[in-house]
Interface confidence: medium
């Protein structure tokens, strides 16, 4: 079920682009969109266990919606309260960077981080 | 996915088993053989950079018989790239460590990865 484009990683029927270049959250979002993908939306914290020993943090597709007063993924679905137990302490003006060992932190969206794009192959 | 075993990753026409267990170099070699694959070989610099993003450290299929012998790959070819700490006579197996190739004691317990080409 997996046939990923060049430079993308295939794992469990998803394709991931793992950047080594640092971008702002918005720049990262646009770069993923230009590759017909979106910033990483996590199903669970094991999703990237193939790189769980990485020490880097990566922008993911999570942002705070004032309208819904909730953290939402790019597709509009809400963040599960079980994914990041510390999410209530996140500054709602910030964006979320994720480390594949399961940690997340909030940072200014204008900060530059690496990013991960995801394409689902069904 | 595709032609790779379940729980392996695909990248650039190869399948990779990203191990989390630590083994000696020789144990890693045997573990990969049992998975019908080879201990991680790095064919080019771009592959090395990719693997360094995925995993900070792992054994690679490069070794030497002693510090007086050249570094060779599993198919017996000379390995021409710089391997750090090569002047230490006790370090005769090679490790990928965050974009670097280093020598290490073959009996050390280090994470291993396996690879096979599609």
């Amino acid at each position: 079920c997996c046939s990923c484009q060049e430079k993308w990683v295939g794992y469990r029927c998803n394709c991931y682009f793992i950047s080594s270049e640092q971008k702002t959250w918005n720049e990262s979002r646009h770069l993923c969109a230009s590759q017909k993908s979106s910033l990483l939306q996590l199903q669970n914290t094991d999703e990237l266990d193939f790189m769980s020993s990485s020490q880097q943090f990566y922008w993911i597709g999570l942002s705070y919606s004032e309208e819904h007063t909730a953290w939402l993924w790019e597709n509009g679905s809400a963040l599960s309260q079980y994914l990041f137990p510390s999410f209530e302490t996140f500054n709602t003006k910030n964006c979320i960077a994720y480390n594949p060992n399961g940690n997340a932190l909030d940072e200014s969206c204008e900060d530059k981080n690496r990013y991960i794009c995801k394409q689902q192959l069904i | 996915c595709g032609h790779c075993p379940e729980e392996w990753i695909t990248y650039s026409n190869s399948c990779y088993y990203i191990g989390k267990e630590r083994r000696t170099w020789e144990e890693s070699l045997l573990a990969c053989t049992s998975k019908n694959s080879s201990l991680l070989s790095i064919d080019n610099e771009e592959e090395m950079k990719f693997l360094s993003i995925i995993s900070p450290s792992s054994w690679i299929g490069v070794f030497r018989n002693s510090s007086h012998h050249p570094w060779v790959t599993m198919n017996g070819l000379a390995f021409k790239h710089e391997i750090k700490d090569s002047d230490n006579a006790e370090l005769n197996c090679a490790v990928l460590q965050v974009n670097r190739l280093k020598s290490a004691q073959c009996g050390s317990s280090i994470i291993y990865h396996c690879k096979h080409k599609l």
Partner: antibody, heavy 118, light 107 residues
Framework: EVQLVESGGGLVKPGGSLRLSCAAS????????MNWVRQAPGKGLEWVSA????????YYADSVKGRFTISRDNAKNSLYLQMNSLRAEDTAVYYC???????????WGQGTLVTVSS | AIQLTQSPSSLSASVGDRVTITCRAS??????LAWYQQKPGKAPKLLIY???SLKSGVPSRFSGSGSGTDFTLTISSLQPEDFATYYC?????????FGQGTRLEIK
């Protein structure tokens, strides 16, 4: 002996274009990432652009993105930097530099001076 | 981009002195730091990579240390040929960045 020789620098008007070349010898050019680094008169070093061994990965500094294009011809052992829409602040000595499989810049050329002035 | 701040910007020292130059990164870069020496009119020369690994052929009086955000280049006993400008560089992620340089002058 590793050698990198830059050429193509000179005086150009703002808005103009220039193409720098870097001729490599003494090593397997196609195995190495290459970079351009510049240094404005009396100032520090500024990284400009990088290209991986097979041109799969290309990176630019924000200050040149959209104006400069890095490329390479492995058959000719040559690295290039196409510079368009040049500005006064692009005035600098431009160096090409080699990476050794993820090591930082272990060999540099002697540099070529680019002057952007009306 | 990751910013590197070197200190001091310049320093005067004598032959035989022990000299230390520091480099601070705006975010953690593990040990992905290099040090270069540059003399007027010449290309930079790699001294240290991986924060503490000495490039072959570089005199052992040069040493590097540090990890994360704080790094140090030490010259244990200055020689006349060591008077130059020194730069740190991070290669943890793109864009690659250099420190602003430290000019080492004869006292």
């Amino acid at each position: 002996e590793v050698q990198l020789v830059e050429s193509g620098g000179g005086l150009v008007k703002p808005g103009g274009s220039l193409r720098l070349s870097c001729a490599a010898s003494g090593f397997t050019f196609s195995s190495h990432s290459m970079n351009w680094v510049r240094q404005a008169p009396g100032k520090g070093l500024e990284w400009v652009s990088a290209i991986s061994s097979s041109s799969s990965y290309i990176y630019y500094a924000d200050s040149v993105k959209g104006r400069f294009t890095i490329s390479r011809d492995n058959a000719k052992n040559s690295l290039y930097l196409q510079m368009n829409s040049l500005r006064a602040e692009d005035t600098a000595v431009y160096y090409c530099a080699r990476e050794e499989w993820g090591l930082p810049f272990d060999y540099w050329g002697q540099g070529t001076l680019v002057t952007v002035s009306s | 981009a990751i910013q590197l701040t070197q200190s001091p910007s310049s320093l005067s020292a004598s032959v035989g002195d022990r000299v230390t130059i520091t480099c601070r990164a705006s975010q953690g870069i593990s040990s992905a730091l290099a040090w270069y020496q540059q003399k007027p009119g010449k290309a930079p020369k790699l001294l240290i990579y991986d924060a503490s690994s000495l490039k072959s052929g570089v005199p052992s009086r040069f040493s590097g240390s540090g990890s994360g955000t704080d790094f140090t280049l030490t010259i244990s006993s200055l020689q006349p040929e060591d008077f130059a400008t020194y730069y740190c560089q991070q290669f943890n992620s793109y864009p690659l960045t250099f420190g602003q340089g430290t000019r080492l002058e004869i006292k």
